[in-house]
Interface confidence: low
């Protein structure tokens, strides 16, 4: 046997090259036949009326043919025949790969609430062989469940992902990535998660800057509430007491001028949106005003005063529960 050929794998629509090679040539006729055993080429003559077959090289030792715009129907065994005595035959198998025609991602809900489990489906249509689908949430790979449908040698793969969403997932892409021998690099489609979550509340003391509240001073607290959707209502209340009459509320800001001991207590900022509500507490303690020491007459005394600033904030980011998470900064 001195007639050789090689199997060919080609992507649909691209070019397949079939080569019939003769090791020890004696100028015998080389012929190429298709899977239906019709003659494509007899030496350099083409009986088959299919212009997609083009002669690349013809000699006594090689018949090399290109097949352009390959389709699924071209798949199968192609026969090289060498008309020696006795005749020799060798075959090459053309395998056609079809990349997925379309990659579609379908998300159960456009907007989800934190803690909710949503279903995401990705479909890779009409590929050959079947496509492998991988899921990523951002850079993290997730496990999906795939189903394969076969129709006329083509495969449609649908992968289902059940995803429990958290507030950190808001704006993160869910990526459906395809792996297929006909696809080089990454073929992927993605949808961005939109996750609604209840507010997170944080109180900041914007005045006095050093954090020590004394009688006669002013106090300014700013309430920062972040949620999705953005909290519709941010309110200040005084826990277990009325708000001082000289307190001024301006949006997220609470101003108390001319502090006195009766202002001592817990001030709560409450925020809510359609998902839930949360609050953060500020415990106000008003210190005595600084004492003025008269100038000495004969004796010199050095006095060292140590001041401790206490800023206590109690935060609760769980809807409808009493504050139990304490952040204390001494």
């Amino acid at each position: 046997q001195n007639l050789f050929t090689k199997d060919v794998t080609v992507i649909e629509g691209e070019v397949a090259t079939i080569s019939c090679q003769v090791n020890k040539s004696d100028d015998s006729v080389i012929q190429l036949l298709n899977p239906n055993r019709q003659t494509i080429y007899f030496r350099d003559f083409r009986p088959l009326k299919d212009s997609r077959f083009q002669l690349l090289n013809f000699s006594s030792s090689e018949l090399k043919v290109s097949l352009t715009n390959v389709s699924i129907s071209d798949e199968g065994r192609y026969f090289c025949q060498l008309y020696t005595d006795p005749p020799q035959e060798s075959y090459t198998t053309i395998t056609v790969l079809v990349p997925p025609r379309n990659l579609m991602i379908d998300i159960q809900k456009d907007t989800a609430v934190e803690g909710e489990e949503i279903e995401v489906n990705c479909t890779a249509m009409a590929s050959k062989p079947a496509t492998t689908i991988r899921w990523f949430k951002g850079n993290t790979e997730l496990k999906g469940k795939s189903e394969v449908e076969e129709w006329s040698d083509m495969y449609t793969v649908t992968s289902q992902l059940m995803l429990k969403v958290h507030k950190e997932d808001d704006g993160v892409p869910v990526i459906c990535q395809v792996e297929h021998p006909a696809v080089t690099g990454n073929l992927q489609t993605q949808r961005y998660l939109e996750v609604q979550y209840k507010p997170q509340v944080h109180i900041q003391m914007t005045y006095p800057l050093q954090g020590l509240t004394r009688e006669g001073d002013a106090l300014e607290l700013t309430c920062e509430a972040i949620g999705k959707p953005q909290p519709v209502m941010v309110t200040w209340v005084r826990v277990d007491d009325e708000m001082p009459q000289h307190a001024v509320l301006s949006g997220p800001n609470l101003f108390i001028n001319n502090l006195n001991k009766t202002d001592n207590g817990t001030y709560r900022c409450e925020a809510s949106n359609i998902v839930g509500k949360a609050h953060s507490d500020y415990m106000l303690y008003v210190y005595d005003p600084p004492t003025t020491i008269p100038p000495p007459t004969t004796t010199t005394t050095t006095t060292t005063t140590t001041t401790t600033t206490i800023l206590t904030i109690i935060t609760d980011s769980r809807a409808g529960e009493e504050g139990s998470i304490r952040a204390v900064d001494h």
């Epitope: 006909a182 696809v183 080089t184 690099g185 990454n186 073929l187």
Partner: antibody
Framework: QVQLQQSGTELAKPGASVKMSCKAS????????MHWVKQRPGQGLEWIGF????????EYNQKFKDKATLTADKSSSTAYIQLSSLTSEDSAVYYC????????????????WGQGTLVTVSA | DIVLTQSPASLAVSLGQRATISCKAS??????????MNWYQQKPGQPPKLLIY???NLESGIPARFSGSGSGTDFTLNIHPVEEEDAATYYC?????????FGGGTKLEIK
């Protein structure tokens, strides 16, 4: 062989819009992404974005997100770029370029280029 | 965005000598062993033409006097021996991440 034939020179007024075409031949149009690149006179090259003609999926360089709109017509194997709210900064040669990869790899190279369309914005 | 810095901005090389163009990326363009760096040649009034893809692969039809090397962040295009028809501007380009970016270009003049 792969060929990308671009439409002719455009002269436009500031504030106007312009739409250029890139007709592809010699390959299966829907299997390859089509990219667009800008080159101002005497300057370097800037990637505008790409379109997957099979799905209509587009991705833009953030810089051109509000300036360029990429579309494609599968039936005529033609890709389009529309530039809006034109200013003198948009005066440039715009190239379409077919990436040398199969079916949507994002890591590739510009294998084939159109001859370019010159856009001049002038009052 | 990944910034590609080419050097020199221009160079003049005698016929038959070697031209070396450098391209430095602001971050690595290597992924899974592949370098996503490409080189193009552009002559006045013409579109760019692919010379080298994936850092070191010569595009078919391009003369063997063109070669590319490098990995990670540092890449080089070599032309040897330089011929008159090589007078052009050369660009490096990364396809590691969007937005795809080009170097500022190196203008090669033949002495």
């Amino acid at each position: 062989q792969v060929q990308l034939q671009q439409s002719g020179t455009e002269l436009a007024k500031p504030g106007a819009s312009v739409k250029m075409s890139c007709k592809a031949s010699g390959y299966t149009f829907t299997h390859y992404w089509m990219h667009w690149v800008k080159q101002r006179p005497g300057q370097g090259l800037e990637w505008i974005g790409f379109i997957n003609p099979g799905t209509g999926y587009t991705e833009y360089n953030q810089k051109f997100k509000d300036k360029a709109t990429l579309t494609a017509d599968k039936s005529s194997s033609t890709a389009y770029i529309q530039l809006s709210s034109l200013t003198s900064e948009d005066s440039a040669v715009y190239y379409c370029s077919r990436a040398s990869y199969y079916s949507g790899s994002s890591h590739a190279w510009f294998g084939f280029w159109g001859q370019g369309t010159l856009v001049t914005v002038s009052a | 965005d990944i910034v590609l810095t080419q050097s020199p901005a221009s160079l003049a090389v005698s016929l038959g000598q070697r031209a070396t163009i450098s391209c430095k990326a602001s971050q690595s363009v290597n992924y899974d062993g592949d370098n996503y760096m490409n080189w193009y040649q552009q002559k006045p009034g013409q579109p760019p033409k692919l010379l080298i893809y994936a850092a070191s692969n010569l595009e078919s039809g391009i003369p063997a006097r063109f070669s590319g090397s490098g990995s990670g962040t540092d890449f080089t295009l070599n032309i040897h021996p330089v011929e008159e028809e090589d007078a052009a501007t050369y660009y490096c380009q990364q396809s590691y991440e969007d937005p795809w970016t080009f170097g500022g270009g190196t203008k090669l003049e033949i002495k």
